[in-house]
Interface confidence: medium
């Protein structure tokens, strides 16, 4: 299977296919073809942070001990095979599930080369019928596989170590003269096959593990830690049109769903039916004056609805997104044909209840009315349902177009790609990346808290065993209270004999304060599930308060906000664990522990096991975090 940049190389077409049919109307424009593609864009920041956090400079470790990187692009075969229909030599039918095996069988096709990626800044993989047959079926007599993969290890390994900029991989239907709708159907099948980018970086050394399913496997007994990323659409059911809105004039098949189903030749009793305007004229469907009749029907085709008494009929859009307040539903309906019924539109957001859309009629020419309803910018992907509710006897209704317009603002957001990350334990247990390096052992042998964590940059993973790990205080006079790193030597703290960051707030005549400042951390990746984790303890009586302040370096100006606070404490002298989501941090930042106390205070304040989650820098949520106070 070939791969190409920019222009894209074919992933195979049958040598002698069926006779050529009319192509897509004027074929597909560049924009339309682009809309058929699935784009994977791994941001440059991910590469920078992966390099800084996981890949030490090459001179600092022996070649044998250097982390390794692998990558692939995987698609489920079943939807692709369904598109092709039954093929000779396929040992399980396209409609049936893949063979039930312990792991999904896969066949790996060659991905792209580094040389081409360097030249064109993006890798284009075109998938056609031949590649599907090669990747999912293979030679006659071989068992069909459940997974088609492109090997991208060379490419990912180069990009993560030496590459610059973002990694862009475009998967699209192979372009060739073929029957109407082919590219659209192939694109839909590609989407249904849930294409996903799989990356792996693992620290080499000794261990024993079977490789996780669907990943290019490292040698099973040769890694100390193993991180895996899957990049896929956070809403795989979104249509390719979700980026550009939807316009359906019924002249060509649309991605709408109909209830009851659209009339076909096998179904003679019909509700929804697509008919050309000439046929409508011959059928004498309109009651208007004869002279007007030819003008009343739009050119091309439209949708006719034949309803019985008190029935409900629905047109349903594909899954959509909107990034614009101006996103609008527009539907053209014929007034004279539906005196006894009414249209209702519903917004159906993902994971939310439906709500009605206010439809405003704008009278058009020759009896046609455009119903418009503002959709705006729902937080989640959504579908739109147009219901025609007939009342009384049989009635006819006509729809000329169904459109969702102005749903993207500026550059279109496309569907949201999530980069999900995980840590694989030696025994095969898979953890979320955030569980690694948090001072809680989640793997049976504790490898999620071992070598990799200790090699993170200063301040990321700190138990104060080796000093202040980046925490500093201003210049101190001999009598100023100071934060110290030492052990809590006390019978009551036998469960915590190691070092901690401590402050003794001994009784003072006037109020006192002490501040300690962390190392600086880089800006988290936008919309990452970023967290700060730490243990804290207050022993004795605190007449005052302790705050944790997050300071952002915003264009040279420092902006601080309190993220945690405890005051006038006289509670249990127990270590408490806290996890603070670091939302909406867009610049590099540091932390400050600020303690203030007054007369009568006799407390020890302690912090330990401070970590910044790796998710901050190596995970991308599909959805942007929505803060409570945005309106």
């Amino acid at each position: 299977v070939g791969s190409g940049m920019g222009t894209g190389q074919r992933a195979g077409s049958p040598a002698a296919g069926p006779p050529l049919q009319p192509r897509e109307p004027l074929s597909y424009s560049r924009l339309q073809r682009k809309s058929l593609a699935v784009d994977f864009v791994v941001p440059s920041l991910f590469r920078v942070y992966a390099r800084d956090l996981l890949l030490p400079p090459s001179s600092s470790e022996l070649k044998a001990g250097r982390p390794e990187a692998r990558g692939s692009l995987a698609l489920d075969c079943a939807p692709l095979l369904r598109l092709l229909g039954p093929a000779p030599g396929v040992s399980w039918t396209a409609g049936s599930p893949a063979p039930a095996e312990a792991r999904t069988l896969s066949r790996v096709l060659k991905g792209g080369s580094v040389r081409k990626l360097r030249r064109a800044k993006q890798l284009v993989l075109e998938l056609g019928e031949e590649a599907i047959l090669e990747g999912c079926v293979g030679p006659p007599g071989e068992a069909a596989v459940g997974l088609l993969q492109f090997n991208l290890s060379e490419l990912f390994s180069w990009w993560i170590r030496q590459g610059e900029g973002r990694l862009r991989i475009r998967l699209m239907p192979e372009k060739k003269a073929s029957e109407v709708g082919r590219e659209g159907r192939l694109s839909a099948a590609i989407r249904a096959s849930q294409p996903r980018l799989l990356f792996q970086i693992f620290g080499t050394g000794h261990s024993s593990l079977e490789s996780p399913t669907n990943m290019p496997s490292p040698s099973p007994d040769y890694f100390t830690w193993n991180l895996t990323w899957i990049m896929k659409d956070s809403f795989p059911f979104l249509s390719h049109r979700s980026r550009y809105g939807l316009e359906c004039s019924f002249d060509f098949p649309c991605e709408l769903e109909y209830s009851p189903p659209l009339h076909d030749l096998r179904n003679q009793s019909w509700s929804w039916r697509r008919i050309p305007s000439e046929e409508a004229s011959q059928m004498d469907l309109l009651d208007g004056p004869g002279a007007e009749r030819s003008k009343e029907m739009p050119r091309g085709s439209f949708l006719l609805l034949n309803t019985s008494a008190d029935s409900k009929h629905t047109i349903l859009s594909p899954w959509m997104r909107s990034s614009s307040e101006h996103c609008t539903l527009a539907v053209s309906v014929h007034r004279h044909l539906q005196p006894s019924g009414r249209y209702i539109a519903q917004l159906l957001p993902h994971n939310e209840a439906a709500r009605e859309i206010l439809l405003m009629p704008t009278p058009g020419k020759h009896g046609w009315t455009v119903l418009q309803g503002r959709i705006g910018r729902p937080d989640n992907p959504f579908r739109v349902a147009l219901e025609y509710i007939s009342s009384g006897n049989r009635s006819l209704s006509a729809v000329d177009f169904f459109a969702l317009k102005n749903c993207s603002e500026g550059t279109s957001p496309g569907s949201k790609m999530a980069l999900q990350s995980s840590f694989t334990c030696w025994n095969g247990t898979v953890l979320q990346l955030g569980q690694a390096c948090d001072f809680h052992q989640d793997c049976a042998q504790g490898e999620d808290e071992s070598q990799m964590c200790r090699k993170l940059p200063v301040g990321f993973y700190c138990n104060f065993e080796d000093g202040f790990c980046g925490w500093t205080q201003g210049t101190l006079s001999p009598h100023t209270p100071q934060w110290q790193v030492r052990t809590l030597k006390d019978a009551r703290f036998q469960d915590h004999q190691d070092h901690a960051l401590l402050l003794s707030t001994t009784d003072v005549p006037a109020s006192e304060s002490a501040t300690v400042t962390s190392a600086t951390f880089p800006a988290p990746i936008k919309s990452s599930p970023c967290e700060l984790r730490m243990s804290w303890l207050i022993r004795g009586v605190l007449r005052g308060n302790v705050s944790l302040v997050l300071v952002e370096n915003k264009t040279g100006k420092e902006q601080g906000r309190m993220v945690w606070h405890v005051a006038a404490y006289e509670g249990l002298s127990l270590w408490q664990w806290m996890v603070l989501p670091l939302l909406d941090v867009s610049d590099r930042f540091w932390l400050q522990m600020v303690a203030w106390w007054g007369q009568g205070s006799r407390a020890i304040v302690a912090f330990d096991n401070i970590s910044i989650s790796l998710d901050c820098y190596l995970t991308i949520s599909g959805e942007d975090k929505i803060l409570q106070n945005t309106a």
Epitope: S322, E325, H326, C327, E352, A353, A354, R355, E356, L358, M360, P361, T362, V370, Q372, R374, I375, G376, R377, P378, D379, Q628, A631
Partner: antibody, heavy 119, light 107 residues
Framework: LQLQQSGAELVRPGASVTLSCKAS????????MHWVKQTPVHGLEWIGA????????AYNQKFEGKAILTADKSSSTAYMELRSLTSEDSPVYYC?????????????WGQGTTLTVSS | DVQMIQTPSSLSASLGDRVTISCRAS??????LNWYQQKPDGTVKLLIY???RLHSGVPSRFSGSGSGTEYSLTISNLEQEDIATYFC?????????FGGGTKLEIN
């Protein structure tokens, strides 16, 4: 952001009156303008809405024929004409801008216009 | 139309009190519920949209909760400026409908 409504009106039964709502501080055509009636008996009632961009309107069935909504893009002003007035039409009328996502809330309101229908 | 029943119709509380107002819909409105404040001078402001999301500029002492048909507005630490009438409104089905209002007074 402001929705400035016209002043109080005193009109005779059977007559008509036009209330205005001038928008400022945002792009007028980007948002629908809705009208809400408030009476001591019925509380707040939605009358209808206009999309200033297209001129499209939608009405609560209860107010079909009673209220006519229009908008003038050049002056960023929405109008509501109330016809065949009776004493039942004598409360306060508000214009309100609608935000479309979340839950279709009315995020900014005019200060209200008091209408008195009396002979 | 969806009926919105708001309780109580009036209530009296002291400064610093925690106050809760309830709103019940005649059918499931799927969290499409908003709360408004109307001051004695007639000024109306949006407080909370989509059950619990605070409109910009609204103090954090206001909060909303609920689901299905039952919803509530809570003012956690009553202040003098909170003297007003509060209305709920559903945005799930057309026409939009409002609760009868709760007049809040200070003891």
């Amino acid at each position: 952001l402001q929705l400035q409504q016209s002043g109080a009106e005193l009109v005779r039964p059977g007559a008509s009156v036009t209330l205005s709502c001038k928008a400022s501080g945002y792009t007028f055509t980007d948002y629908e303008m809705h009208w809400v009636k408030q009476t001591p008996v019925h509380g707040l009632e939605w009358i209808g809405a206009i999309d200033p961009e297209t001129g499209g309107t939608a009405y609560n069935q209860k107010f079909e024929g009673k209220a006519i909504l229009t908008a003038d893009k050049s002056s960023s002003t929405a109008y509501m004409e109330l016809r065949s007035l009776t004493s039942e039409d004598s409360p306060v009328y508000y214009c309100a801008r609608r935000r479309y996502y979340g839950s279709s809330s009315f995020d900014y309101w005019g200060q209200g216009t008091t209408l008195t229908v009396s002979s | 139309d969806v009926q919105m029943i708001q309780t109580p119709s009036s209530l009296s509380a002291s400064l610093g009190d925690r106050v809760t107002i309830s709103c019940r819909a005649s059918q499931d409105i799927g969290n499409y519920l908003n709360w408004y404040q109307q001051k004695p001078d007639g000024t109306v402001k949006l407080l909370i949209y989509y059950t619990s999301r605070l409109h910009s500029g609204v103090p954090s002492r206001f909060s909303g909760s609920g689901s299905g048909t039952e919803y509530s507005l809570t003012i956690s630490n009553l202040e003098q400026e909170d003297i007003a009438t509060y209305f709920c409104q559903q945005g799930s089905a057309l026409p939009p409908t409002f609760g009868g209002g709760t007049k809040l007074e200070i003891n």
